[in-house]
Amino acid sequence: KSSNEATNITPKHNMKAFLDELKAENIKKFLYNFTQIPHLAGTEQNFQLAKQIQSQWKEFGLDSVELAHYDVLLSYPNKTHPNYISIINEDGNEIFNTSLFEPPPPGYENVSDIVPPFSAFSPQGMPEGDLVYVNYARTEDFFKLERDMKINCSGKIVIARYGKVFRGNKVKNAQLAGAKGVILYSDPADYFAPGVKSYPDGWNLPGGGVQRGNILNLNGAGDPLTPGYPANEYAYRRGIAEAVGLPSIPVHPIGYYDAQKLLEKMGGSAPPDSSWRGSLKVPYNVGPGFTGNFSTQKVKMHIHSTNEVTRIYNVIGTLRGAVEPDRYVILGGHRDSWVFGGIDPQSGAAVVHEIVRSFGTLKKEGWRPRRTILFASWDAEEFGLLGSTEWAEENSRLLQERGVAYINADSSIEGNYTLRVDCTPLMYSLVHNLTKELKSPDEGFEGKSLYESWTKKSPSPEFSGMPRISKLGSGNDFEVFFQRLGIASGRARYTKNWETNKFSGYPLYHSVYETYELVEKFYDPMFKYHLTVAQVRGGMVFELANSIVLPFDCRDYAVVLRKYADKIYSISMKHPQEMKTYSVSFDSLFSAVKNFTEIASKFSERLQDFDKSNPIVLRMMNDQLMFLERAFIDPLGLPDRPFYRHVIYAPSSHNKYAGESFPGIYDALFDIESKVDPSKAWGEVKRQIYVAAFTVQAAAETLSEVA
């Protein structure tokens, strides 16, 4: 399925011409340009950047570039009434206060409008009480506290370390446990890699560095006030009490210098085991409360942030397709940052900018892609994927009929060790074939393919000689396209060595220290990893938009469906007695997977043999491929999560960042032994097996011969 058959082409206008036009030096220049001042969503600076990108994309040669604006709920600290946490003595005097801001990095001392660290969408409040240390505040951490250690978090302020799971899940878990406030902190065990210096001398987090971030539990809703519909000029907005996903208790993030002051006084129970100990010189006692002489001291939070409906701007660029203009391949990444956005998002935005420039150069030479390519610079991703979700809500009818694929383009790097790809199984073969054609940027792999270095450094746990490709979860702008609309999606970036660097994300994530210099000095001085990511993302878009037959292999879906069915069955089989008692059977699911496998195999055979010169048959076969992902969408959505509609994949209910397979069945089985009504609980398991089996069978039938 070569891309050389693109329209209006001379031989040079192929994938190679597109890739050769991508230049590391340009990406470097764009990154510098995008990172000199903060571009917080809803601010004038970010609006100006949107207009700059619009203007440059037009210059690069796109057919049209428009701004799409929405008025969404955002959250900001009160400029005159800062947020902080204090330790108070028995008289109510504040004997310790946390920092009000991060010490600015060298060269940025005079930059204005650096938003201080805060947890976006925290309600206002000044709770005071005893502290309980809750490790990562995961579901299993609260189970350990409540069930094993008999610690009641009700009415307590909990302190949790960042990492492992999305911060919004931590806050939700704390709320469910009855906490009245949450303090989030970065522990050096998770955000300080051994043997590396702190910024500005290295890429580690200094003690005064703090991770910002939203703490919503939107479950795909987009703007909290207009779930399901665009936040346009005539939108009906919910009252704040009915808003989706807002936390109900105050939350605030701190660095490890401040955390040390809180944790060193902790009393109560010893930590349950070493997995609860970080790297600070404190006992990591769980509490509740402070020990001995400090037992009369309490912790008090002072949170004064406000939620405000604010205008945001997406930039949408169009490169019209020559043959199938009504088929859309979308490349999108966000533009808004917490501060300078040196990695998140501008390392991604700079790559998108260079991809647009390369496509524009080809277009100016008379080339057009077969299908339409849409380029998006999303706003307000950091506030809950708002820009992408509102745009997709506004254009949902077009997207569900015309959307071929969505490629995400947030941060291009989170390390410089190897490639990391998360995508639909439909794209596995595309990614494999593309990376075999690209050169590896890795030291020691000169002259070798990217596929080879990737496979060596990140091998698949199931298939030898193949690289690991992960499930899509959420926490980024592909969410609405994949989880709600069922558009085949993928993402790629360069990552760290997960085996040797066990910290969560990269140490300076969402801090003021995420600067251009961080990237240029420590992560990618030659911008060779950025260039590789540009080639992967751009190459995927090129192939998706240009190949005559869509580069999707439905047989790979069959393989993973069987794997996921085996996995969920083995989870259920931990309860053999109940399965017998309640007549729980997975036969229907395994039968549907078997049918899918057989039908996919036959479809693939027909795909090799059909007459590609017949435009009607070609379109028919491509539509079956395009609509296969759509066939996994259940219009009713998952229980209590109506905007997560994909039956095969959803963000984990316990960690938004992670993908879960057969999420309906998984959630029905989760902690089932603790359910008060086992008959009802197992009834729900049976219902979810039925939904999954039906959906897989229905999807299989979309691949059958049409008549």
């Epitope: 299993e140 189970f143 350990k144 069930r147 094993d148 250690m149 008999k150 009393g267 109560g268 129970s269 010893a270 349950p272 085991d273 070493s274 997995s275 006992p283 006692n285 409360g289 020990t291 001995g292 037992s295 931990k574 032994e673």
Partner: antibody, heavy 116, light 107 residues
């Protein structure tokens, strides 16, 4: 219902090793830490260490460090405690106990006798 | 290590008596103390945790109190089935440590 079933009594010679098993049932094995506590005849209970079955990481009482190894087999929902370089004073009943810091569920105990 | 010292080591009381066992920690442990009951030839059973909270199913004649270094287990009205050895345990610091036990008999 929750059950912790330990392996049977052992008689060992000084210098030998013993490995005691503890099979869990009625709950999700990986959700709860497993501890080992011993009791020599007429003596107090003595905490030896624990394992987090989810990660396989063990924490030990320094008194036994180097001699005790706690492991688990999640597929069999079983925890193991191996004590090496046995001496006569290691004669005791060895208990597995589920929990974190405090122990609500105990195995029935395994008597290990060290005698030449 | 934190030493837990119980007193008395043994005691004899009549059915219906109020019985008090004390436990002293060598350093402050806040309220991170549990009490266990062990009958001859049996495994220990959790009675009290967090110094004063009764475990599920434990009769309300058992109560605990204390914080810091001094802790007490009280049986308000001794019953024949309460004949056992009672152990305190601290879980404020590793290694977790137990008292030497108090053997309770019926007169």
């Amino acid at each position: 219902e929750f059950q912790l079933v330990q392996s049977g009594a052992e008689v060992k010679k000084p210098g030998a090793s013993v490995k005691v098993s503890c099979k869990a049932s009625g709950y999700s094995f990986t959700d709860h830490n497993m501890n080992w506590v011993r009791q020599a005849p007429g003596q107090r209970l003595e905490w030896m260490g624990l394992i987090n079955p989810n990660y396989g990481t063990a924490d030990y009482n320094q008194k036994f460090k180097g001699r005790v190894t706690i492991t688990r087999d999640t597929s069999a929902s079983t925890a193991y405690m191996e004590l090496s370089s046995l001496r006569s004073e290691d004669t005791a009943v060895y208990y597995c106990a589920r929990g974190s810091s405090l122990f609500a569920y105990w195995g029935q105990g395994t008597l290990v006798t060290v005698s030449s | 290590d934190i030493q837990m010292t119980q007193s008395p080591s043994s005691l004899s009381a009549s059915v219906g008596d109020r019985v008090t066992i004390t436990c002293k920690a060598s350093q402050g442990v806040d309220t991170a103390v549990a009490w266990y009951q062990q009958k001859p030839g049996k495994s220990p059973k959790l009675l009290i945790y967090w110094a004063s909270t009764r475990h599920t199913g434990v009769p309300d004649r058992f109560s605990g109190s204390g914080s810091g270094t001094d802790f007490t287990l009280t049986i308000s009205s001794l019953q024949p089935e309460d004949v056992a050895t009672y152990y305190c345990q601290q879980y404020s610091r590793y290694p977790l440590t137990f008292g030497q036990g108090t053997k309770l008999e019926i007169k």
